[in-house]
């Protein structure tokens, strides 16, 4: 007789991250049998949704639900029509959507209550859409990284299953960079957190943390870089803005209302003589960087020690996983080995910024323009915000790894948001089987 | 003061389809959703869809999906529920009910005065 | 879909009386909660919403309380124009469910 595959027990979630640039959905799978199990959900897809993030739907809600049918209907045909209906959906929309709710808390639930009501026409288990806190946002990105990494799993090894694995059950810390806000996120030595805002407790697999995470609204890189121009249009003499944070030989046009119509910018507001200003690059890395240390603000600490803006940050401690915009600039730069020093970051960005424009497009012909042309300033962010912002030094460099993903999966808040709602993460650890397969090489 | 008044009540073949009509009088309709709701006989409620007039966007519970079409109509502020393929089961008093707002105020302040669709050979 | 599962189906009360209706969804659903009042013939009327807002023109002897999975309408001491039956209903997720429903009589 033929040997019939007997039929995969298997479960799906799927989880939409809509950030301020664009919306994400990626499909997990799990065996059925061992979902307390730790590292056992994977990744088996991402999809990119085409277009913005959601809060830009605002004066179109009619068409959200044309954005999210491609990314819908490929969860669709991924997922097995037999598990359609036992299949989770979360949508978690974070600070693109935080600024909205800022700005009107009704045009905010008037775009969640149509992406709402357009995932709920899908064969799945929809479980809701919600915008997450940036404690959740950062808390579920160091999960997801430990969790992937195994430092959850109280089984020692003397052999490396995954990249950046030091071989303890120390975790790493997370360190998270969107478009409209950052995170940072780590279990401090031996420190009191000192304000209560910035403290998580967990127990996960018979084990307390203690977290230290506090996420920076609009200090994502785009928000950063509205910040950064609305602050030197204000000393400029006329509508030109010779920027050192562009190419040499760059020009953009910026529409005085676009500059004003985020929250972020609202500290740097005044009335200008002009609708509009251009942009003109001048390249220069170091002059970037002043510009974009006027955006932290160190001068005032209520704590033992601060970040910047009066934020409390414990003393660094471990090693780090940088990831989202972390890892997508620093990999387009080429700076994501581990041999790379922060001298030698900083040297390749001074190089990297001077370059002229038509040089730097001829170079990535096939990068668009729009995120060609920011590529200096973010790069020249991600050091200020991890020097000065959060005071690595050019010796802790070392401990920063620019992670994209991990066994497979990307690295960021949606695998340990899933996990948390699907009650996947026990705080005790669980009975193990007899003679669990670990316990051999 | 806002109204929502139903078409009147029908008596429909099995396999034959039948459409009813929620016209609102007196106030703003199309920022407002509109869900349907259906009761059979010495039964409780039960949710089928929902439209936004504004936006011609609908949503409908699994069961209804592919049997039932949800319309509005802004420039005479009315709203339709059309239900294909019916059978005997189907009989009942179909609502109209405005939702309170959006995203989690779905809660019906406004009805109809109800449908009674009947399902007969 | 959240299940609605409402206790009793049947509650025989006094005029004058206390009566506690009970409502428990299957999933946590905050304090997305609603309850209507149905009276033979009629539509659903508001009662509460967000689990224990009063809708506008209702009663004071109308309560509701609860927020996750356990829910209660509270009627402080029941009139004649109340006996009707009762049904909760979650507006957190769709689908929108609602409760089987409680009739309260007349003991």
């Known amino acids: 007789t033929q040997n019939k595959a007997l039929p995969e027990n298997v479960k799906y979630g799927i989880v939409l991250d809509a950030g301020s640039s664009h919306t994400s959905l990626y499909i997990y799978k799990w065996p059925a049998e061992k979902e307390n199990d730790t590292g056992v959900v994977h990744q088996v897809e991402e999809c990119r949704v085409k277009g913005p993030g959601i809060s830009k739907f605002v004066q179109k809600v009619n068409e959200i639900g044309i954005y999210l049918t491609d990314c819908m209907e490929r969860a669709r045909e991924v997922i097995p029509r037999s598990q359609h209906q036992e299949t989770p959906v979360y949508l978690g929309a974070t600070a693109g959507m935080r600024l909205l709710r800022m700005e009107s808390e009704e045009l905010a639930d008037r775009v969640l209550d149509v992406v709402e009501r357009s995932l709920s026409n899908y064969p799945f288990d929809f479980q809701g859409a919600r915008i997450i806190t940036g404690q959740e946002e950062g808390a579920y990105g160091w999960i997801t990284i430990n969790y992937l990494l195994g430092k959850f799993s109280q089984k020692t090894r003397w052999f490396s299953i995954v990249p950046y694995e030091t071989n303890n059950q120390e975790t790493f810390g997370a360190l998270d960079l969107g478009g409209a806000s950052t995170q940072v996120t780590f279990v401090p030595q031996n420190q009191t957190i000192e304000s209560p805002d910035n403290a998580l407790q967990f127990r996960l697999y018979g084990k307390d943390y203690n977290v230290y995470t506090h996420s920076f609204l609009c200090y994502g890189k785009d928000q950063a870089l509205w910040q950064k121009l609305a602050k030197d249009i204000q000393v400029a003499s006329n509508e030109i803005l010779r920027d050192p944070c562009f190419h040499p030989g760059y020009k953009k046009v910026v529409n005085v209302s676009d500059l004003y119509k985020t929250p972020c910018t609202k500290r740097f507001e005044m009335t200008l003589p002009f609708q509009q200003f251009e942009i003109q690059g001048i390249g220069n890395y170091q002059q970037c960087h002043q510009s974009i240390l006027e955006l932290f603000n160190t001068s005032y600490c209520p704590y033992s020690q601060c970040a910047f803006n009066g934020i409390f940050l414990p003393p660094l401690q471990g090693d780090f996983g940088a990831f989202s915009a972390f890892y997508f600039v620093m990999k387009f730069l080429n700076l994501t080995s581990e041999k790379v020093s922060q001298e030698k970051v900083t040297e390749m960005m001074k190089k990297f910024c001077a370059q002229p424009w038509e040089e730097i497009k001829t170079s990535y012909a096939g990068v668009k323009e729009k995120y060609l042309s920011e590529y200096c300033f973010s790069g020249t962010y991600i050091l200020s915000l991890l020097l000065q912002g959060y005071h690595f030094t050019a010796d802790s460099w070392e401990h920063i790894h620019f992670i994209g993903k991990i066994q497979g999966s990307d690295a960021g808040w949606t695998l340990g948001y899933m996990l948390n709602l699907t009650n996947m993460i026990p705080a005790e650890q669980p009975l193990s089987t007899p003679l669990s397969h670990s316990t051999y090489v | 003061q806002v109204q929502l008044v139903q078409s009147g009540a029908e008596v429909k073949k099995p396999g034959s389809s039948v459409k009813v009509s929620c016209k609102a009088s007196?106030?703003?309709?199309?920022?407002?959703?509109i869900s349907w709701v259906r009761q059979a006989p010495g039964q409780g409620l039960e949710w089928m869809g929902s439209?936004?007039?504004?936006?011609?966007?609908?949503n409908y519970a699994q069961k209804f999906q592919g049997r039932v079409t949800i319309t509005a109509d802004e420039s005479t502020s009315t709203a339709y529920m059309e239900l294909s393929s019916l059978r005997s089961e189907d009989t009942a008093v179909y609502y109209c009910?405005?939702?309170?707002?959006?995203?989690?105020?779905?809660?019906?302040?406004?009805w109809g005065r109800g449908t009674l669709v009947t399902v007969s050979s | 879909e959240i299940v609605m599962t409402q206790s009793p189906a049947t509650l025989s009360v006094s005029p004058g009386e206390r009566a506690t209706l009970s409502c428990r969804a299957s999933?946590?659903?905050?304090?997305?909660l609603a309850w209507y009042q149905q009276k033979p013939g009629q539509a659903p009327r508001l009662l509460i919403y967000?689990?224990?807002t009063r809708a506008t023109g209702i009663p004071a002897r109308f309560s509701g309380s609860g927020s996750g999975t356990e829910f209660t309408l509270t009627i402080s001491s029941l009139q004649s124009e109340d006996f009707a039956v009762y049904y909760c209903?979650?507006?957190?997720?769709?689908?929108?469910?609602f409760g089987g429903g409680t009739k309260v009589e007349i003991k």
């Open positions: 209903q979650q507006h957190a997720l769709w689908p929108l469910t």
């Open positions: 967000g689990a224990s």
């Open positions: 439209i936004i007039p504004e936006f011609g966007i609908a």
């Open positions: 999933q946590s659903v905050s304090s997305n």
């Open positions: 007196g106030g703003t309709f199309a920022s407002y959703a």
């Open positions: 009910a405005r939702e309170a707002g959006y995203y989690r105020y779905r809660y019906f302040d406004l």
